[in-house]
């Protein structure tokens, strides 16, 4: 039976240019974790193996960071990065663990909101 | 001035599919995503998902992934929900809503839609 | 998904009331940099929902100042000030720190 639960950093709103840490931690399990892949829609952005450490996918080298821990650093943002980021956690003997975190890139930090309006 | 203007009252009978949308106007389009929000008779509101129309990127709640499919036309500033395989559950009140950092700002008149045979 | 829960679901009213409305998250609606993702809406009858309150106490705009909001973490609270006949309604909560954004189950501000 499964029972970890995933933590995640929770949805970012951040500015165009800026960089952001997404993370994730898997908990109330003792599954061993064998792999992290982060995903964005259908792309793969990054794997980190227990065994064989990370991979960067081409098209992203020049953005994304490994790390911190098992997180990932997406640097350089523009608009098009804003939509959902997924961390799935392979472990044994449990399988299959899924993270979800909504990254959400804006122009400008003066929003139409209003002049409070929080970014990181 | 932002307005949402949705489609008109829906009757369906059971099994069918239809598409609802809502013209945005009045501010960038592609500078804000759009949630859809179901309000069943007498029960609190519920997000179906989020698209992004600068890019298309979607998010589902995922109660809803197999019951909606969100897309946007940017040329005319519209976005659709199509919802599958209707059953007397879908029966509700659906609108759609401009959001940003997380809350949804302003929202569309709703569309009705009653699924009967 | 997080769980989020108002009280009370029904609250009676006079007009020039003073009122609080409560809504409690299962997790905390902080995210990793501070930030929380907390709003309030009015539903009137045969109306929209209509943005208040942002960002747990940022008031959007057009919205009178006898509204106001607060909280942290998993704790948050709308009060209004001075109940107006306008003011009646239904409540919601909103988050939109964790997947997917959830409301809170409504709180319904009435005429004693």
């Known amino acids: 039976m499964m029972t970890g639960t995933i933590e995640t950093t929770g949805n970012i709103s951040a500015e165009k240019g800026g960089s952001i840490i997404l993370q994730c931690h898997l908990s109330s399990t003792t599954a061993q974790v064998t792999q992290v892949n982060w995903e964005q829609q259908d792309q793969l952005l990054a794997i980190c193996n227990a065994d064989l450490g990370w991979h960067i996918s081409p098209s992203f080298k020049d953005r994304v960071a490994p790390g911190p821990g098992l997180g990932l650093t997406l640097q350089s943002l523009t608009v098009n990065d804003t939509g959902e980021y997924f961390c799935i956690y392979h472990t044994y003997p449990d399988g299959t663990y899924t993270g979800r975190i909504f990254l959400e890139v804006l122009e400008s930090s003066v929003a139409e909101h209003g002049a409070r309006f929080q970014i990181p | 001035e932002v307005q949402l203007q949705q489609s008109g009252p829906e009757l369906v009978k059971p099994g069918v599919s239809m598409k609802m949308s809502c013209k945005a106007s009045?501010?960038?389009?592609?500078?804000?995503?759009m949630s859809w929000v179901k309000q069943s008779h007498g029960k609190s509101l519920e997000w179906i998902g989020l698209?992004?129309?600068?890019?298309?990127?979607?998010s589902y709640n995922q109660k809803f992934k197999d019951k909606a499919t969100l897309t946007v036309d940017k040329s005319s500033t519209t976005a659709y929900m199509e919802l599958l395989s209707l059953t007397s559950e879908d029966s509700a009140v659906y609108y759609c809503a401009r959001s940003r950092t997380f809350a949804m700002d302003y929202w569309g008149q709703g569309t009705s839609v009653t699924v009967s045979s | 998904d997080v769980v989020v829960t108002q009280t009370p679901l029904s609250l009676p009213v006079s007009f020039g009331d003073q009122v609080s409305i409560s809504c409690r998250s299962s997790q905390s609606l902080a995210n990793s940099y501070g930030n929380t993702y907390l709003s309030w809406y009015l539903h009137k009858p045969g109306q929209s929902p209509q943005l208040l309150i942002y960002?747990?106490?940022n008031r959007f705009s057009g919205v009178p100042d006898r509204f106001s909001g607060s909280g942290s973490g998993t704790d948050f609270t709308l009060k209004i000030s001075t109940i107006k006949p306008e003011d009646l309604g239904m409540y919601y909560c909103?988050?939109?720190?964790?997947?997917?954004?959830?409301f809170g189950g409504g709180t319904k501000l009435e005429i004693k």
């Open positions: 009045g501010y960038s389009f592609t500078a804000y995503t």
């Open positions: 960002g747990i106490s």
């Open positions: 909103l988050q939109g720190t964790h997947q997917p954004w959830t």
């Open positions: 698209i992004n129309p600068y890019n298309g990127g979607i």
